[in-house]
Interface confidence: low
């Protein structure tokens, strides 16, 4: 018995179905086929879980969180024992193992391993200003999304005809910050933060209004 090499890693957007491949060759009839799928979740590597089991001609549910969402892609028994997971959740991310036994064929590699990463687009980011908006001050524009896998990067742009940040601005796309030093009237305007990752983007807007000093009355 020999389980074929798997693609190694699969990525899927949250809520979408995933297919985890596992096929094998065997010299024996599929009378005593026994297949177990296990997962070592990324979120809890110390607690491997059973996903689905095929034994004695019957299918058995694994961990409760997979109930109703998991099944074999084809009619069993078969040499293709790939499974699908519907409505993928973030907690489904992990390392999946298919373990195949088909007595009396007991030689060879009986395990296939596939990594599953459930991707999440960035949630609507939160934009805010830190610091005084008085002319000549330094301000920091902050942007962050609660969710996003892989971790989003953040791009700030000023919504004017140039889409460029003021020359005194420095941007950190990982942290989602823009520091604008020595703000002036020209710094005023609408700023947009674009949070993006491999499967989506999301934006927020921020209105920066630089406050000029009030003229003092004489006399």
């Amino acid at each position: 018995l020999e389980v074929s090499e798997s693609p190694g890693s699969i990525q899927v957007a949250r809520g979408q179905p995933a297919v985890l491949p596992c096929t094998f060759t065997t010299s024996a009839a599929l009378i005593n086929l026994n297949v177990i799928w296990m997962v070592t979740p990324l979120s809890n590597a110390n607690q491997p879980e059973q996903v689905i089991l095929y034994q004695g001609g019957q299918m058995f549910d694994g961990a409760p969180r997979f109930h109703g969402r998991v099944g074999f892609t084809g009619t069993m028994p078969a040499t293709n024992v790939s499974i699908f997971i519907n409505n993928t959740q973030l907690s489904d991310t992990g390392t999946y193992q298919c373990l195949v036994n088909n007595l009396p064929d007991i030689g060879g590699r009986n395990i296939g391993v596939t990594g599953l990463t459930v991707l999440v687009p960035p949630s609507a980011p939160h934009c805010q200003i830190q610091g005084s908006q008085d002319i000549g001050s330094d301000v920091i524009l902050l942007c962050s999304s609660e969710e996003g896998i892989p971790r989003p990067t953040y791009l700030w742009e000023k919504l004017d005809n140039t889409l460029k940040l003021p020359p005194t601005a420095t941007q950190d796309q990982v942290q989602g910050t823009v520091t604008i030093r020595n703000i002036s009237a020209l710094s005023s305007g609408l700023y947009q933060c674009v949070a993006s990752n491999a499967i989506g983007t999301s934006t927020c807007l921020l209105d920066l209004q630089v406050i000029s000093p009030q003229p003092r009355n004489i006399g």
Partner: antibody, heavy 121, light 108 residues
Framework: QVQLVESGGGVVQPGRSLRLSCAAS????????MHWVRQAPGKGLEWVAV????????YYADSVKGRFTISRDNSKNTLYLQMNSLRAEDTAVYYC??????????????WGQGTLVTVSS | ETTLTQSPGTLSLSPGERATLSCRAS???????LAWYQQKPGQAPRLLIY???SRATGIPDRFSGSGSGTDFTLTISRLEPEDFAVYYC?????????FGQGTKVEIK
Amino acid sequence: QVQLVESGGGVVQPGRSLRLSCAASGFTFSSYAMHWVRQAPGKGLEWVAVISYDGSNKYYADSVKGRFTISRDNSKNTLYLQMNSLRAEDTAVYYCARASPSQWLVLGHYWGQGTLVTVSS
Amino acid sequence: ETTLTQSPGTLSLSPGERATLSCRASQSVSSSYLAWYQQKPGQAPRLLIYGASSRATGIPDRFSGSGSGTDFTLTISRLEPEDFAVYYCQQYGSSPWTFGQGTKVEIK
């Protein structure tokens, strides 16, 4: 036939180190997870550690975490247990066991004869 | 960690009698993740039951497992002379894997 033979046990002083080996034969070693289980004299069984077939996943009992390291060399069909900072309470017969083919979390049918580790000053 | 408590500590019975061994978990164990082992003096343990009720290969059908949640039972329907030994339950649903303290089945 399946054989598991442990070696490396003996008498060692507290705080010292010891490395146990388990030589496997009669099956495709690289396809099976392997466990270490110990049994103190006259006491019950205590699971120590497990390693997945390719060595990518390892789990330990709290009592040995940070002191013991399970590893394997599939090219040599050998399982290892590196035991550091040994304590008197680590005195036990140490068994290696092959996981069940259908569930690698189950210790399975096949166990070695055990090797005795005595930690004493 | 999940603590398993076995009872009774010792069971004195005669060959041909029925043996009922109990294993209680401190927290719920998925029935897919409980095993029973037999150990005779000077020997390594032997897997009898896994998944709470699935007999391991080569295990006689006089051995049966049942239970779910926190209460599990190993039943030996008719004791044979070779069944007198120590029996351990073990959970493998959460790390660390843990064993019960054992039940000794001895000849009355």
